[in-house]
């Protein structure tokens, strides 16, 4: 048995006569043989669930669910209740109604076995019938909504009449009907005004019924019509077995360059027309098991269950359903030497499904793990300016397909043939497994004998120690111009184009900083700033070279404070800025301010 609502509302007036009917509560059956029996909780409750008093005023007919006054609620009774309401004015009280077979403790009131009945209290006697508006004659102030379980026997779930009005204003005629389309499973009995289901409902066909209740009031010659929404929600049960959309029960996958732990290798989708079990219970009751195969497969793969609610069309309306994605995921990084093919089976069990048929599916994954061999091109040729500053990025080295790698740890090293000409360094970028070449020693760049630099690039897979090698030939171009000692170490200090471009800074490939003119559109990623190279800084990402020194690109790398209009980067730097952004790395501060059109002296004074 279950209540068709979790809450009911009615009005109470001072000195309403004993015997006044108040309202009906309704229970629906889960099985044809069930007979409801209602009982009231012992207490009346007030604001914030305050227990006010034993309920001496309201009774219920156990078999019909009719609540009525068994004694009048007078002023003194009301004041007695008000005193206990923690000092709040007593505007509403409520009672708990239980379905008898359920031996719920009084303290708890949870649908489906308990409903609350709220009474709005009016410190006046019942108004004259002639003063009541049609809306007050027809419907309670709070619009009801109903919940009906699918596949359950049909039954009565509502009674339209406002019983106190019918009892105290017998001369006013009130008629009700339901506006509904053809073939809907509800009827309103013209005599009793009871609303019932005609047949068992199927949530997978329709989940919500947005009906309209029409009330016609006849008072003498006057006729008025009032319409209110009458929503019914159908509650789900696990009556649908999981299925494969379009019958796809097998997925094939190749593991090659993406070998990192947590990589999703393949996904199979399971559809279930139900939305139960609820999300909290779902993973526990909708199980997936990787069936035992060889030990290597068990250690290497795991299955992740990702349920998601979706909408499907049924009979012209949308109903909720669930799609379950089962992802085959790498449990560990795979060595580049690993080479095997296997079939994996996953058993999916909707353990709440009662049939007919089985709530079990078998998913198949065909997986090929291919080995990866390291290759570098035979030779790299690059050029570098003699004016390049320390940490200037001059190029990349990359084993074949390195951009696609994940979970493969390749380290790059440079071996110089000329001991005194070891100008360059290399660092491995975790993002794309490439090696970034940068200027490490500017003194060597200036030596006349270091006009051509010869290196051997060695790429080593850290797990297997497999290697690839390539020649690197670097031509040093241009003439050296001594840097000015007064120039800031960081290009980012400069706030204006002129002062930016007449200085160099750490990370500058040309020996000169570059001005990036912003788009001037409020707080933007494209803010104006001074950079060692606009190719790499700022780009919203503190790369592996930039991490070596905060002076290279504080716009991407600063962990300190940013003053002015900006959006902070994740996890550091400036993601977006207002106007021009400049930085003082040693103070760990950046400033984003409107484009400056004042004269230079003002800027210096304002520093």
């Amino acid at each position: 048995l279950y209540f068709s609502r979790d809450a009911y509302w009615e009005k109470l007036y001072v000195d309403q006569a004993a015997g006044t009917p108040l309202l009906y509560v309704h229970a629906l059956r889960d099985a044809p043989e069930e007979v409801p029996s209602f009982r009231l909780g012992q207490h009346l409750y007030g604001t914030y669930r305050t227990r006010l008093h034993e309920n001496n005023w309201i009774c219920i007919q156990e078999d019909t669910g009719l609540l009525y006054l068994n004694r009048s609620l007078d002023h003194s009774s009301w004041e007695k209740l008000s005193v206990r309401n923690r000092g709040f004015p007593l505007l509403t009280v409520y009672l708990k109604v239980f379905l008898s077979p359920t031996s719920l403790r009084e303290g708890e009131c949870q649908w489906p076995g308990c409903a609350r009945v709220y009474f709005s209290f009016f410190n006046t006697s019942f108004p004259a019938c002639s003063s009541l508006k049609p809306r007050e004659l027809c419907f309670p102030e709070t619009r009801p909504s109903f919940r009906i379980r699918e596949n359950r026997p049909p039954g009565t779930f509502h009674q339209f009449r406002l019983l106190p009005v019918q009892f105290l204003c017998p001369n006013i005629s009130v008629a009700y009907r339901l506006l509904e389309g053809e073939g809907l499973p509800f009827r309103c009995a013209p005599d009793s005004l009871e609303v019932s289901t005609r047949w068992a409902l199927d949530r997978e066909q329709r989940e919500k019924y947005e009906l309209v209740a029409v009330c016609t009031v006849h008072a003498g010659a006057r006729e008025e019509v009032v319409m209110v929404p009458f929503p019914v929600t159908v509650y789900d049960e696990d009556d649908s077995a999981p299925t494969f959309p379009a019958g796809v029960d097998t997925a094939s996958a190749v593991v090659e360059f993406k070998r990192k732990e947590d990589t999703v290798v393949a996904t199979l989708r399971v559809f279930d027309a139900d939305v139960v079990p609820a999300s909290g219970e779902l993973v526990r009751r909708y199980t997936s098991t990787l069936l035992p195969g060889d030990t290597w497969a068990q250690q290497t793969f795991r299955v992740e269950h990702w349920p998601n609610e979706t909408s499907v069309q049924a009979n012209g309306s949308f109903v909720r359903a669930t799609v379950h994605d089962y992802r085959l995921v790498l449990n560990r990084n795979l060595s580049i030497s690993e080479n095997r093919t296997m079939q994996l089976a996953v058993l999916v069990n909707d353990s709440d499904f009662q049939g007919p048929g089985a709530g079990v599916l078998l998913l198949h994954f065909n997986v090929s793990v291919l080995p990866v061999s390291l290759h570098l091109p035979s030779t790299y040729s690059l050029s570098v300016s003699r004016r390049a500053r320390r940490f200037a990025q001059i190029g990349k080295v990359c084993v074949e397909n390195c951009q696609a790698f994940s979970g493969i740890n390749v380290q790059y090293k440079l071996h110089s043939s000329g001991a005194n000409c070891s100008t360059l360094g290399v660092v491995t970028s975790a993002e794309d497994t490439s090696g970034i070449l940068f200027v490490n020693d500017t003194k060597a760049l200036r030596r006349p004998k270091c006009a051509e630099l010869h290196y051997m690039v060695v790429a080593t897979d850290q797990q297997t120690s497999r290697q690839a090698q390539a020649q690197l030939l670097v031509t040093v171009e241009g003439s050296y111009v001594a840097e000015e000692a007064g120039c800031p170490l960081s290009c980012a200090v400069s706030k204006r184009r002129l002062e930016c471009e007449e200085c160099g800074g750490l990370g500058s490939p040309t020996g000169r900083c570059e001005w990036r003119q912003g788009d001037g559109k409020g707080i933007t990623r494209n803010f104006s700033t001074c950079s060692p190279s606009t190719k790499t800084c700022p780009d919203g990402h503190c790369d592996v070279v930039e991490t070596q020194d905060i002076n290279i690109c504080p716009q991407d790398c600063l962990r300190g404070s940013i003053v002015g209009g900006h959006e902070p980067g994740e996890p550091r730097g400036i993601k977006a800025g207002y106007g021009t952004c400049n930085c003082f790395p040693e103070e760990e501060k950046c400033f984003c301010e409107p484009e400056d059109i004042q004269d230079p002296l003002c800027d210096e004074l304002c520093r």
Epitope: R390, A482, E484, A485, G486, C487, P488, L489, S490, V493, E502, D549, I550, N551, F584, P585, E586, E587, E588, L601, E604
Partner: antibody, heavy 119, light 107 residues
């Protein structure tokens, strides 16, 4: 507040060595370039040596090149000047000074330590 | 090396006077010039950097101007505490050089 305190000065014979220290506090030492500047008694200021914030680059005046070595220990917030083959003309008050990477002028100076080279 | 020549070497003036000290560089140093004040037995103190920018905490009677090779330090109204030796300093080249100094005396 920013403080620079020099130590290690004293009287030394020509040809001998001395090591000066400059202890820094009140700022993030590792972020700043540092200098040694000297002043002979009754004379003007004379730049001696410079070291980058990270120790990656050093510069020396011609008069001390090959004899003096500048170094720093960022973990101890200390700047050093190793002075070898000292001469009488190296007699001076030696100051350490701070160089903010964003502005590059010598913005804070220590109170100095006196080195006297005499037989 | 860049030579820095200061003039005059000595300057006698009275409280309330406006005084100007000149510094000339042997080649262009753009605006990379600092002015220091030094009192006997004390370390130099920055007054002006980048030729014309007043150091924080320095009274506004001090001002600097110039760029390239010609620079001036002006004290608009001498105060008793201003009598000291003043040095210019170029930081354009890593061979830093100082002017020989200007001694400002009470007349």
């Amino acid at each position: 507040q920013v403080q620079l305190v020099e130590s290690g000065g004293g009287v030394v014979q020509p040809g001998r060595s001395l090591r000066l220290s400059c202890e820094a506090s009140g700022f993030t030492f590792r972020n700043y370039g540092m200098h040694w500047v000297r002043q002979a008694p009754g004379k003007g200021l004379d730049w001696v040596s410079t070291i980058y914030y990270d120790g990656s680059d050093e510069y020396y005046s011609d008069s001390v090149k090959g004899r003096f070595t500048i170094s720093r220990d960022n973990s101890k917030n200390t700047l050093y000047l190793q002075m070898n083959s000292l001469r009488a003309e190296d007699t001076a008050v030696y100051y350490c000074a701070r160089d903010p990477p964003s502005f590059r002028y010598f913005d804070y100076w220590g109170q100095g330590t006196l080195v006297t080279v005499s037989s | 090396d860049i030579q820095m020549t200061q003039s005059p070497s000595t300057l006698s003036a009275s409280v309330g006077d406006r005084v100007t000290i000149t510094c000339r560089a042997s080649q262009s140093i753009r605006s990379w010039l600092t002015w220091y004040q030094q009192k006997p037995g004390k370390a130099p103190k920055v007054l002006i950097y980048k030729a014309s920018t007043l150091e924080r905490g320095v009274p506004s009677r001090f001002s600097g101007s110039g760029s390239g090779t010609e620079f001036t330090l002006t004290i608009s109204s001498l105060q008793p505490e201003d009598f000291a030796t003043y040095y210019c300093h170029q930081y354009s080249s890593y061979s830093y050089t100082f002017g020989q100094g200007t001694k400002l005396e009470i007349k």
